[in-house]
């Protein structure tokens, strides 16, 4: 595809390796050049598939650095998007390089959800917070949201006791265990364990995506308070 | 995140005695409580002693070390210490300390911010 302003195919080279990275759904674009003696500027454009008349936006005009910011520029996370981007050196552009399809949702990471964990007389409470993400620049939770398909499902929720793992779900849908902030696991002590540590992911809907790992939380409960 | 050295562990015969070390880097160490563990290789980490934040405040010790160990810190130098008397072979482990939460009945810590710990050996 070229630009109106390109004055003939090898006169300016095209960018390479237009790559896109999202981290809680923040979606930067990246991409390569070689160096050349005068310094080249970069416009970056975005389509968004899905919308009405969907039509190439621009994102980041004439900027000197390697990447863009796209965030501001996406619309439903779960959606495909595609970027181009085209150099300028003096009054000569490239032709536009594209980027491969892309969906914030599916391609991207979303940081681990944070834990605490405490004892209330014979349960440990684990509290799972959802993870925060960006979304047109507002911070949010990535709990359960019937208007968006992309939002965390369920947490599988990893719980060590002495020595051996037990794997437990929790539905992000079930009121009695979830609400916007967080999902709520009780688990009964027993006078044969007292160690416990738990780690969770989250695991988004449709594409089974998993949110990273949280860190492992662990509690020993002291000997005197777990016999009987 | 508070960076952590444990020292003062080596060869000592059965009876024998140590003092471990633990010196924290970080202005916070006096927020957090501390707790000492030891691992034998192939089992988990097991809590031995704890030290809630404050200075002589409540400590916490495993059945298998009470009336032998004593953990006490000393927060204008960061450092955390575990006096180790009348040690038996089966104290052998390396030893471990990390930050953590004092609660009534718990210790809660995060199972990431270990040093590279200290070996004790007890021979008999």
């Known amino acids: 595809e070229m630009g109106t302003a390109d004055l003939g195919p090898s006169s300016v080279p095209t960018p390479t390796n237009v790559t896109i990275e999202s981290y809680n759904m923040n979606p930067i674009v990246y991409w390569e050049y070689q160096i050349m003696p005068q310094v080249p500027v970069f416009t970056v454009e975005v389509k968004n598939y899905g919308v009405k008349n969907s039509e190439w936006i621009d994102a980041c005009i004439n900027i000197s650095h390697h990447y863009c910011n796209i965030s501001d520029h996406v619309g439903d996370p779960s959606n495909s998007l595609w970027v181009r981007v085209k150099a300028r050196v003096g009054q000569k552009e490239s032709a536009y390089a594209k980027s491969e399809e892309f969906a914030v949702c599916r391609d991207g990471k979303i940081g681990p959800p944070k834990l605490d964990i405490r004892k209330e007389e014979k349960q440990i409470m684990i509290d799972i917070f959802h993870p925060s993400v960006f979304v047109n620049g507002d911070e949010q939770e990535v709990d359960y949201d019937p208007e968006t398909t992309c939002y965390i499902r369920v947490y599988n929720v990893y719980v060590r006791m002495n020595g051996s793992e037990i794997q437990y779900k929790i539905l992000t849908q079930k009121e009695d265990d979830c609400d916007e902030i967080q999902c709520q696991l009780a688990i009964p002590v027993s006078s044969l364990n007292s160690q416990y540590c738990v780690s969770a992911e989250g695991v988004l809907h449709v594409w089974g995506v998993t949110t990273e790992k949280s860190k492992e939380v662990c509690i020993t409960i002291f000997n005197s308070s777990i016999k009987g | 995140e508070v960076q952590l050295v444990e020292s003062g562990g080596g060869l000592v015969q059965a009876g024998g005695f140590l003092r471990l070390s633990c010196a924290a880097s970080?202005?916070?160490?006096?927020?957090?409580?501390m707790g000492w563990f030891r691992q034998i290789p192939g089992k988990e980490r097991e809590l031995v002693a704890a030290?809630?934040?404050?200075?002589?405040?409540?400590?916490y010790y495993a059945d298998s070390v009470k009336g032998r160990f004593t953990i006490s810190r000393d927060n204008a130098k960061n450092t955390v210490y575990l006096q180790m008397l009348s040690l038996k072979p089966e104290d052998t482990a390396v030893y471990y300390c990390?930050?953590?939460?004092?609660?009534?009945?718990?210790?809660?810590?995060?199972?990431?911010?270990w040093g590279k710990g200290t070996q004790v050996t007890v021979s008999s």
């Open positions: 970080g202005r916070t160490f006096s927020s957090y409580a």
């Open positions: 990390t930050t953590g939460d004092y609660y009534s009945d718990y210790f809660k810590y995060d199972n990431e911010n």
């Open positions: 030290i809630s934040s404050w200075s002589g405040g409540s400590t």
